[in-house]
Amino acid sequence: KSPIFGPEEVNSVEGNSVSITCYYPPTSVNRHTRKYWCRQGARGGCITLISSEGYVSSKYAGRANLTNFPENGTFVVNIAQLSQDDSGRYKCGLGINSRGLSFDVSLEVSQGPGLLNDTKVYTVDLGRTVTINCPFKTENAQKRKSLYKQIGLYPVLVIDSSGYVNPNYTGRIRLDIQGTGQLLFSVVINQLRLSDAGQYLCQAGDDSNSNKKNADLQVLKPEPELVYEDLRGSVTFHCALGPEVANVAKFLCRQSSGENCDVVVNTLGKRAPAFEGRILLNPQDKDGSFSVVITGLRKEDAGRYLCGAHSDGQLQEGSPIQAWQLFVNEESTIPRSPTVVKGVAGGSVAVLCPYNRKESKSIKYWCLWEGAQNGRCPLLVDSEGWVKAQYEGRLSLLEEPGNGTFTVILNQLTSRDAGFYWCLTNGDTLWRTTVEIKIIEGEPNLKVPGNVTAVLGETLKVPCHFPCKFSSYEKYWCKWNNTGCQALPSQDEGPSKAFVNCDENSRLVSLTLNLVTRADEGWYWCGVKQGHFYGETAAVYVAVEERKAAGSRDVSLAKADAAPDEKVLDSGFREIENKAIQDPRLFAEEKAVADTRDQADGSRASVDSGSSEEQGGSSR
């Protein structure tokens, strides 16, 4: 027997559209092989009407399509504008028509009930509002007004002027009788459901002289927009539901089995744990439109998404909605990069951020995801020389190694740095990636004094102790500024005595500042790297003061008087002002990201994403 399955019989009416789903075992071969829909002839052949390879018969031109859903093991044949000529025996199948991988389908198109004379047709989107107008004559002005719905063969009362409301319409229907001058009553139904579709009859009066008017209500379900995005990339759902729901709670949900739609995020503060750290719901405009950005796309993110508006912040019957079918392409152009980076308190991390290598000139950014409210991502640093004030001296964005990757270094880590960070550019918005920084138990590998005071005109030597694990790494000192960290000459002073159980491969590398000037004040980093790949760093703040006594300064670890978590700044330390974003394209859909970067840091808890792709602070 054939493994293909579908409906044996399909019954429809003229003018209707039909979607026929055929199911196949989703093996690798089946997913990629040709899918077809053919009509069986009297002599046993089967003439192709449409196939997945793009063929469409002239009989189906402009009214049919075939869509394959390989991840589900289904393909769907949509046929519109059915006529009785479409009645017949068909096959849906895989491969070649004459082979056995097919299923027989009988399609019967009947003439249909047709609309009664004088029927007004109302076509309205799901979740919206319809007003059915019902005229009547003067003799029925004082008589009962009513609206019936034809269910099968029987009219069922929906609402009447004596106060009756059918339970299926409770809370979303009203009957309005116009002023005495107008011989018209109207029935307003809002939060329209698919089940509201059908034929209605309005009536004024109950006897043989009653006035009647027929109405045909068609409720349109939104067709899902097909969205294809790369694994590890990003997707933005733009949701415009109209000004009438501007003040109603918004949501994005993902359809699971049956008719359940699990909330991914909503404006009431709910967020699915699987999206922690990688989702933003951007503030809505006055017209009620909003957008949702999801980064770090995973295979399991594929599926059908709905955005909508409802006071509960979740999908209910009658919610106005928009739909998308998200496909996640596993043959991604976005390279793998660690989704978790670990560092120790007082230590550092170096994060590699991928970007579209065709956009090497784009501005690079790094922001901190905050879960409060609907999620926001205040910028911390960019490649144009802006650094958020609280991060001066301990955060740098480097264009290296280049060719599709930039590096962000954050040192002087504290538990408050744990959290989710986004790498992004002002170019390709699909290349947004997420990394989680975790603060783990341990000691920093590099040892430097906590803070140092230099004397004007004298010489200052600052030590940095590198353990033997970094023997093969290049060791450097640099002076931090808001555009990066400029390399400085340093001296290798032989093995360090700062490490227990560490042999001759440990190193003490010193930074020497001759004839100190005011310009030497600032942050200095020592660090390790291999080629263009950066490892751990440690930061020292050098303050400069007036000469008190002659001589040079040689700072040792013992003289350090600041804990790794502290940053000792003199009162004259200059804070860089908040930088305005120049490029208006940046975050066109997420103003919150750009507008809120000058707000104070809040406390952040680390959330374990359960990722297996982890990276230590000093590894590549």
């Epitope: 044996e8 399909v10 209707n16 026929i20 199911y23 289904t74 459901r193 089995s257 049956g258 008719e259």
Partner: nanobody, 126 residues
Framework: EVQLVESGGRLVQAGGSLRLSCAAS????????MGWFRQAPGKEREFVAT??????????YRAEDVKGRFTISSGAAKTTVWLDMDALNPEDTAVYYC?????????????????WGQGTLVTVSS
Amino acid sequence: EVQLVESGGRLVQAGGSLRLSCAASGLTRSDYAMGWFRQAPGKEREFVATLKWSEGSRFMYRAEDVKGRFTISSGAAKTTVWLDMDALNPEDTAVYYCAAGFNVGFVRRASEYNFWGQGTLVTVSS
């Protein structure tokens, strides 16, 4: 709340016929699926047949091993579904469940159906 009530199950001789009936109440939507599954002692629940109404069209699905013997049909108001079973054999012995659901995609998957009846026992003796 949707409620499904099955009836018609009984003991029947091999080769005999039987009509099962399922009456639904509370189905307020126009698009849904309604059909039959069965579960023999010690076996998984398996798909038998389903009718699905969607956007003005009706779709009929049957399991391969009941084709030519079992027929599924419905009343005009779509709230009653019948399963006519002919040429019954002992392998058809099972509890037959009526199931209904909105947005049913994979009709053969029990998990796609939201509502279930209590079941009616069909015993086919040889």
